[in-house]
């Protein structure tokens, strides 16, 4: 098994991830590992020489780059926040700020926008990945209600009057809770509070 540098007549190298074809000398040379860059190119008699990326720069993959990429912060103006710092081996990891979703994607999220409100009687469908898309509002399931316009409010179960020693004065809807009353008191017509003790 040849070790780099070695001649390659068919312009391909055995280990595509860790080696590359150098056309000038028609040889296969080692790539530099993540966190490093090429400080001296290979020749027929000497393999690639790699050096560690300087502070504030990185290379994520096996490479034959002569520079490292500059670390960049997540852009808060674009609604992004940082979840992990840049290191010599990876770029800064960003995500949408809470209450936002990714509206523009170019290999990674570049722009986040505010999640839409879900109207009363609905809630946002739970997604596998937070921040991946705008809210899709779905109706509250039977026996639940949600009484605000909000991007994040969840449907809550209707109050069970009997659990509190009360009786139902008005049934709950998708947008309002059950109204309960003391079993000994009639409900005045103007009362619309959730619970009367």
């Amino acid at each position: 098994q040849a070790v780099p540098p070695y001649a390659s007549e068919n312009q391909t190298c055995r280990d595509q991830e860790k080696e590359y074809y150098e056309p000038q000398h028609r040889i296969c040379c080692s790539r530099c590992p993540p966190g490093t860059y090429v400080s001296a190119k290979c020749s027929r008699i000497r393999d690639t020489v790699c050096a560690t990326c300087a502070e504030n720069s990185y290379n994520e993959h096996w490479n034959y780059l002569t520079i490292c990429q500059l670390c960049r912060p997540c852009d808060p103006v674009m609604g992004l926040e940082e979840i992990a710092p840049c290191t010599s081996k990876r770029k800064t990891q960003c995500r949408c700020q809470p209450g936002m979703f990714c509206a523009a994607w170019a290999l990674e999220c570049t722009h986040c926008e505010l999640l839409s409100d879900c109207p009363p009687g609905t809630e946002a469908e739970l997604k596998d990945e937070v921040g991946k898309g705008n809210n899709h509002c779905v109706p509250c399931k039977a026996g639940h209600f949600q009484n605000t316009s909000s991007p994040s409010a969840r449907c809550q179960p209707h109050t069970r009057c009997e659990n509190q020693g009360l009786v139902e004065a008005a049934p709950g809807t998708a947008q309002s809770d059950t109204t309960c009353k003391n079993p000994l008191e009639p409900l005045p017509p103007e009362m619309s509070g959730t619970m009367l003790m």
Epitope: E55, P73, V77, A84, P85, T87, K89, Q93
Partner: antibody, heavy 116, light 107 residues
Framework: QVQLVQSGAEVKKPGQSVKVSCKAS????????LHWVRQAPGQCLEWMGW????????QYNEKFKGRVTITADKSTSTAYMELSSLRSEDTAVYYC?????????WGQGTTVTVSS | DIQMTQSPSSLSASVGDRVTITCKAS??????VAWYQQKPGKAPKLLIS???YRYSGVPSRFSGSGSGTDFTLTISSLQPEDFATYFC?????????FGCGTKVEIK
């Protein structure tokens, strides 16, 4: 060479606020994150948050959100950490530190004592 | 938050001894772990970054190893100036978290 010089010790009463400064020199202030870390007596080191002076954006540890504010003045290459609604358990040494794969550079620390 | 559990919390050793300190992360942090030395009244000093890379100027008797969740700091031959407290830290994700320290004392 990189230097981070912090303001002097502070004694505060519960409920008050404290503002600690960290003056940076020996590097380009706007291109590196500055973090604040505290060490209470007999406690673990605790990361509070960072500021990126280039865009003056700060991000905080949820534990301190609403009580801590980190700011930076580019003209004087100085970062500030303000902690409000102080309580006795905030008695600690507060450090600023510049990050790169850990914290290679630290300020000398500022002792904040909270006592009635 | 990621917990960094360091052990032992203290140890007694003699000059020339080999000392091993371990740190366990509550979830995978890759190699994004640093080790620090701290002496009383002083700021911590970076010894190791990326789990195993010695910071410039750090003596070769200090070495780090590990990846994922289990990390080790080794002092191959303890010197008088090494009696101090040692901390691990993960910088894989925010919030950054630290181990609570290992105090290395003279036997």
């Amino acid at each position: 060479q990189v230097q981070l010089v912090q303001s002097g010790a502070e004694v505060k009463k519960p409920g008050q606020s404290v503002k600690v400064s960290c003056k940076a020199s020996g590097y380009t202030f706007t291109t590196y994150y500055l973090h604040w870390v505290r060490q209470a007596p007999g406690q673990c080191l605790e990361w509070m948050g960072w500021i990126y002076p280039g865009n003056v954006h700060a991000q905080y540890n949820e534990k301190f959100k609403g009580r801590v504010t980190i700011t930076a003045d580019k003209s004087t290459s100085t970062a500030y950490m303000e902690l409000s609604s102080l309580r006795s358990e905030d008695t600690a040494v507060y450090y600023c530190a510049r990050s790169w794969e850990g914290f290679p550079y630290w300020g000398q620390g500022t002792t904040v004592t909270v006592s009635s | 938050d990621i917990q960094m559990t360091q052990s032992p919390s203290s140890l007694s050793a003699s000059v020339g001894d080999r000392v091993t300190i371990t740190c366990k992360a509550s979830q995978n942090v890759g190699i994004n772990v640093a080790w620090y030395q701290q002496k009383p009244g002083k700021a911590p000093k970076l010894l190791i970054s990326s789990a195993s890379y010695r910071y410039s100027g750090v003596p070769s008797r200090f070495s780090g190893s590990g990846s994922g969740t289990d990390f080790t700091l080794t002092i191959s031959s303890l010197q008088p100036e090494d009696f101090a407290t040692y901390f691990c830290q993960q910088y894989d994700t925010y919030p950054f978290t630290f181990g609570c320290g290992t105090k290395v004392e003279i036997k």
